[in-house]
Interface confidence: medium
């Protein structure tokens, strides 16, 4: 449905204040580092001139399309070479060239400080002076420093952040009121940020096909009892969402999840009985909700897949005349019967029948070749069965911050030459999954692990993909988006890798550790461990948990000593000569 | 990774003052420690001054001691040498350099180094 004037399209559409928030998310997320105060000022200029077209459609520039009109107004920018060097080349470029350049210019890991939160009555304050900034604010930081938050759901996070701050700033105690809630907020942030950020990389790096292949195989899972075609046109619609979003098209994107929403709950019946509560919703909760939702319960008569699938004379028939439709019914058939799998394992028990279909179809007797395929996908199967058994088991005996410590091990003892706050950062991360998956049942474990550890490792992926120094890291993470973990766990201690010189200082500790949060001392002594593992690969777990032990124990020592400063250089000494001699160094 | 990059440098009369600037990116300074160092014409690379990552523990080369400051602002991931009172054997090429969380007394303890600027003390 072609319209004269596509900025009045979604203005309308949208209404002004989700578009108001969707350009400003959209500026924010492709020149991260510009101030505030300069893209509130390009929002309104941009909602000023989408109200002249809405009243008029065929006024000046009113036909131009959306990359062309935000890409104008971002290259007016008048610091954008100093501030931004080459991307400022974009500037030259015709659409759909520069916007493709602007998206290549994202930032995963832009130079931005640290979000430091105010005391709870200076943000009641300001959220009271001014609501509207406040809450401005809020989007414009959170975008850039997430380039590819899923802007809809971002809107979603803005309105929770704003009914927190509209309840608890009138209660009696407000920190007990609010600071739970930012605390909730900004976890969940950040994992939605993860989540989309494998989206897109899946969209980008992988392609639609890979994307599709995804979507069939979760909301198969999602919405058993829906036929084949429904779950098509959903992928499909929701092929279209993320596609826009990873693309920077906001708008477009917002408006079509809105309308993606809309269809699912209009279709309720053909596609889920878990879907009541949410189609009750207003729009952002609703579509929050249908993204989270529970899958249904699995048709109770459904027949062996082995049937259509291998034990028919037609296999090779059907394959032929359309593979990707033949491939996505098999992804369909075994994901809908399997909600204990995580996405990944469907994918590649999809990715090994279709490698043996390609094989046996060109064979003498294919029927005798491929009759065993489903054979193949036993130790598929058991590998992440095994590996989650026994990695549950490890985190029930050491707890979250050790767990987290066996990992941050295993991993620089893989990729040694990743640097020292990333390695920490995302062992931290995969060390999180005991506490998220270990406290389900079996049939939920796997697919909260494994799709858990897909993010995380993409959010590795990423990082290192900007300043790239380990080949296993850059071979794992291209090869194939579904095998990443398995690469990953199958990596061995690095032999190629030159242990880092012994530097005494990196093991010595002030007095200031002693004020710092748990979650900052523990980063301080990870970071310290991951820097003795790059010293000493070879070193036993033995003794980097004797080590460990002592260096924890030191800590609380000089903690509690009335003279701090010299507890820790005194004792600071002894102990990093004992670990010396623990470890040989 | 961390990529460094140093600016501020120039001309500067004996007696006068300038202000070096180590600003990263590619990565957070928060869990680094950052340390200024200086190359003249013929001679040793030589540590002039380090910063821990807390901001905490700060120490000199005798011969800035009481002339040359450093600082850190986490928040803009940058960290500044202030100089003043500058002499000619001041001259050199300065460099930062990050290490993990604590200040190195080698050269060779530090991981990432910056590509230089030229300070010059002339009259």
């Known amino acids: 449905d072609a319209h004269k004037s596509e900025v009045a399209h979604r203005f309308k559409d949208l209404g002004e204040e989700n578009f108001k928030a969707l350009v400003l998310i959209a500026f924010a997320q492709y020149l991260q580092q510009c101030p505030f105060e300069d893209h509130v000022k390009l929002v309104n200029e941009v909602t000023e001139f989408a109200k002249t077209c809405v009243a008029d459609e065929s006024a000046e520039n009113c036909d131009k399309s959306l990359h062309t009109l935000f890409g104008d107004k971002l290259c007016t920018v008048a610091t954008l070479r100093e501030t931004y060097g080459e991307m400022a080349d974009c500037c030259a470029k015709q659409e759909p060239e520069r916007n493709e350049c602007f998206l290549q210019h994202k930032d995963d890991n832009p130079n931005l400080p640290r979000l430091v939160r105010p005391e709870v009555d200076v943000m009641c304050t300001a959220f009271h002076d001014n609501e509207e900034t406040f809450l401005k604010k809020y989007l414009y930081e959170i975008a850039r420093r997430h380039p590819y938050f899923y802007a809809p759901e971002l809107l979603f996070f803005a309105k929770r952040y704003k009914a927190a701050f509209t309840e608890c700033c009138q209660a009696a105690d407000k920190a007990a009121c609010l600071l739970p809630k930012l605390d909730e907020l900004r976890d969940e942030g950040k994992a939605s940020s993860a989540k989309q950020r494998l989206k897109c990389a899946s969209l980008q790096k992988f392609g639609e096909r890979a994307f599709k292949a995804w979507a069939v195989a979760r909301l198969s899972q999602r919405f058993p009892k829906a036929e084949f075609a429904e779950v098509s046109k959903l992928v499909t619609d929701l092929t279209k969402v993320h596609t826009e979003c990873c693309h920077g098209d906001l708008l477009e994107c917002a408006d079509d999840r809105a309308d993606l929403a809309k269809y699912i709950c209009e279709n309720q019946d053909s596609i889920s009985s878990k879907l009541k509560e949410c189609c009750e919703k207003p729009l952002l909760e609703k579509s929050h909700c249908i993204a989270e939702v529970e899958n249904d319960e699995m048709p109770a008569d459904l027949p062996s897949l082995a049937a259509d699938f291998v034990e028919s004379k037609d296999v090779c028939k059907n394959y032929a005349e359309a593979k990707d439709v033949f491939l996505g019914m098999f992804l369909y058939e075994y994901a809908r019967r399997h909600p204990d799998y995580s996405v990944v394992l469907l994918l590649r028990l999809a990715k090994t029948y279709e490698t043996t279909l390609e094989k046996c179809c060109a064979a003498a007797d294919p029927h005798e070749c491929y009759a065993k395929v489903f054979d193949e996908f036993k130790p598929l199967v058991e590998e992440p069965q095994n590996l989650i058994k026994q990695n549950c088991e490890l985190f029930e005996q050491l707890g979250e911050y050790k767990f987290q410590n066996a990992l941050l091990v295993r991993y620089t003892k893989k990729v040694p030459q990743v640097s020292t706050p990333t390695l920490v950062e995302v062992s931290r991360n995969l060390g999180k999954v005991g506490s998220k998956c270990c406290k389900h049942p079996e049939a939920k474990r796997m697919p909260c692990a494994e799709d858990y550890l897909s993010v995380v490792l993409n959010q590795l992926c990423v990082l290192h993909e900007k300043t790239p120094v380990s080949d296993r890291v850059t071979k794992c993470c291209t090869e194939s988006l579904v095998n990443r973990r398995p690469c990953f766990s199958a990596l061995e201690v690095d032999e190629t890798y030159v242990p880092k010189e012994f530097n005494a200082e990196t093991f010595t500790f002030h007095a200031d550790i002693c004020t710092l949060s748990e979650k900052e001392r523990q980063i301080k002594k990870q970071t310290a461990l991951v820097e003795l593992v790059k010293h000493k690969p070879k070193a036993t777990k033995e003794q980097l948990k004797a080590v460990m032990d002592d260096f924890a124990a030191f800590v609380e020592k000089c903690c509690k000593a009335d003279d701090k400063e010299t507890c820790f250089a005194e004792e600071g000494k002894k102990l990093v000569a004992a670990s010396q001699a623990a470890l040989g160094l | 990774e961390v990529q460094l990059l140093e600016s501020g440098g120039g001309l500067v009369q004996p007696g006068g003052s300038l202000r070096l600037s180590c600003a990263a990116s590619?990565?957070?300074?928060?869990?680094?420690?950052i340390g200024w160092f200086r190359q003249a014409p013929g001679k040793e690379r030589e540590g002039v001054s380090c910063i821990a990552s807390s901001g905490g523990s700060t120490n000199y080369a005798d011969s800035v001691k009481g002339r040359f400051t450093i600082s850190r602002d986490n928040s803009k991931n940058t960290v500044y040498l202030q100089m003043n009172s500058l002499k000619p054997e001041d001259t050199a090429v300065y460099y930062c350099?990050?290490?993990?969380?604590?200040?190195?007394?080698?050269?060779?303890?530090?991981?990432?180094w910056g590509q230089g600027t030229q300070v010059t003390v002339s009259s």
């Open positions: 350099a990050a290490a993990v969380l604590e200040c190195r007394t080698v050269v060779r303890g530090y991981d990432y």
């Open positions: 590619g990565e957070t300074l928060d869990y680094y420690a």
